[in-house]
């Protein structure tokens, strides 16, 4: 299953990065799981994950740094609280969970660049 | 003549970006000209240029947004005053001017990403 995502995204100076993850569904899935993975130094870690029913809202856990919305085969993902040290390749993984058969799709990754802002001068 | 430069550089939150431009000199050049070009929307414009004698300092014009130092076949370039709208591909062009023969080398470009900082809150 093909998953498309942008090659590069810049986080805002507030540490927020948004990108679209789009998948070409081979079937009529009603339940979809979206996972954001971060790859750095050949280590892959899970950033966040959400399961949603087609036509319903995408809901991440309350303490997740991710939020998102879905529209058809597109998922709009937003990652917050990013620092310069979080710069890396963020991979979108899509799994069609129900009905069977299960399908897997993994994007090539979005390089998210994050620059820490300069601190503001103290107000006297 | 081969010219190497990094693929990607992030400007600091102060709008400063630095990168190294390295060239493989086919001869014993004593006079070298370095030009930084910006490519955006298939338009190429000159950002800055400097000519230097090998072993001497690299000197840009006083009103230039570029500064630099040279060491052997390496030039350390710094571009200042960058804004988000200046994000683009910055190409390093190196010309061996003297003694003859003349040689030209053009790098593949460095994608410089610039994020405008959030304004600091007004101090009351």
């Amino acid at each position: 299953m093909h998953v498309a995502q942008p090659a590069v995204v810049l986080a805002s100076s507030r540490g927020i990065a948004s990108f679209v993850c789009e998948y070409a569904s081979p079937g009529k899935a009603t339940e979809v799981r979206v996972t954001v993975l971060r790859q750095a130094d050949s280590q892959v870690t899970e950033v966040c994950a959400a399961t949603y029913m087609m036509g319903n809202e995408l809901t991440f856990l309350d303490d997740s740094i991710c939020t998102g919305t879905s529209s058809g085969n597109q998922v709009n993902l937003t990652i917050q609280g990013l620092r310069a040290m979080d710069t890396g390749l963020y991979i979108c993984k899509v799994e069609l969970m129900y009905p069977p058969p299960y399908y897997l799709g993994i994007g090539n990754g979005t390089q998210i660049y994050v620059i820490d802002p300069e601190p503001c001068p103290d107000s006297d | 003549m081969h010219v190497a430069q990094p693929a990607v550089v992030l400007a600091s939150s102060r709008g400063i970006a630095s990168f190294v431009c390295e060239y493989a000199s086919p001869g014993k050049a004593t006079e070298v000209r370095v030009t930084v070009l910006r490519q955006a929307d298939s338009q190429v414009t000159e950002v800055c240029a400097a000519t230097y004698m090998m072993g001497n300092e690299l000197t840009f014009l006083d009103d230039s947004i570029c500064t630099g130092t040279s060491s052997g076949n390496q030039v350390n370039l710094t571009i200042q005053g960058l804004r988000a709208m200046d994000t683009g591909l910055y190409i390093c062009k190196v010309e061996l001017m003297y003694p003859p023969p003349y040689y030209l080398g053009i790098g593949n470009g460095t994608q410089i990403y610039v994020i405008d900082p959030e304004p600091c809150p007004d101090s009351d």
Epitope: M1, H2, P26, L37, V44, E46, T51, K93, E95, M97, Y98, P100, P101, Y102, Y103, L104, G105, I106 | -
Partner: antibody
């Protein structure tokens, strides 16, 4: 170290039932999908079933659908395979395997296997 | 269901030889192919996932490539410990089918 240990195999008559267990240690069991894979004597590998990390999804090979049930107890770090209506062709070494984080169906850790023989 | 085929089914080689095994899926499975090594009486060992990514600890003499329906596993210089049976497996869609295996034995 990361380890999977299967148990519960044995000789059983056709039509009867058997329950296999797989005890996991050395990793956070509740974070991984788990699989059962079998290998008939002198044959290749055959995927049997998978269960998601939280038990929310289960998928089966057509050859065992309706007869076998995969389950897990995350509090006990244990994976199970309930096998009913056993047939001679179910005779095999049964392996439990851990699904990889990135690709759940890539099995990165395997147990040593437990042998099931269905014979009258 | 996606069928997996492998060729050759067996091959004889010597230590130091370069060995290539091919795996074909009955439909496009993108890059979602894994490779395993199994020695007699032992459990399979995970070698490669997503067509070409080596699992940590796997010797660099192993490499793999491919996309769509066609994939290859290459051992650049066969070592004594590499004599085994190699299986490919698709992780694209359920049921997660294995290839029939390729047995690599000593010439």
């Amino acid at each position: 170290q990361v380890q999977l240990v299967e148990s519960g195999g044995g000789v059983v008559q056709p039509g009867r039932s058997l329950r296999l267990s797989c005890a996991a240690s050395g990793f956070t069991f509740s974070s991984y999908g788990m699989h059962w894979v079998r290998q008939a004597p002198g044959k290749g590998l055959e995927w049997v079933a998978v269960i998601w990390y939280d038990g929310s999804h289960k998928y089966y090979a057509d050859s065992v659908k309706g007869r076998f049930t995969i389950s897990r107890d995350n509090s006990k770090n244990t994976l199970y395979l309930q096998m009913n209506s056993l047939r001679a062709e179910d005779t095999a070494v049964y392996y439990c395997a851990r699904g990889a984080v990135v690709v759940p169906a890539a099995m990165d850790v395997w147990g040593q296997g437990t042998t099931v023989t269905v014979s009258s | 269901d996606i069928q997996m085929t492998q060729s050759p089914s067996s091959l004889s080689a010597s230590v130091g030889d370069r060995v290539t095994i091919t795996c074909r899926a009955s439909q496009n499975i993108s890059r979602y192919l894994n490779w395993y090594q199994q020695k007699p009486g032992k459990a399979p060992k995970f070698l490669i996932y997503v067509a070409s990514i080596l699992q940590s600890g796997v010797p660099s003499g192993f490499s793999a490539s491919g996309s769509g329906p066609d994939f290859t596993l290459t051992i650049s210089s066969l070592q004594p410990e590499d004599f085994a049976t190699y299986y490919c497996q698709q992780s694209y869609s359920t049921p997660f089918t294995f290839g029939p295996g390729t047995k690599v034995d000593i010439k």
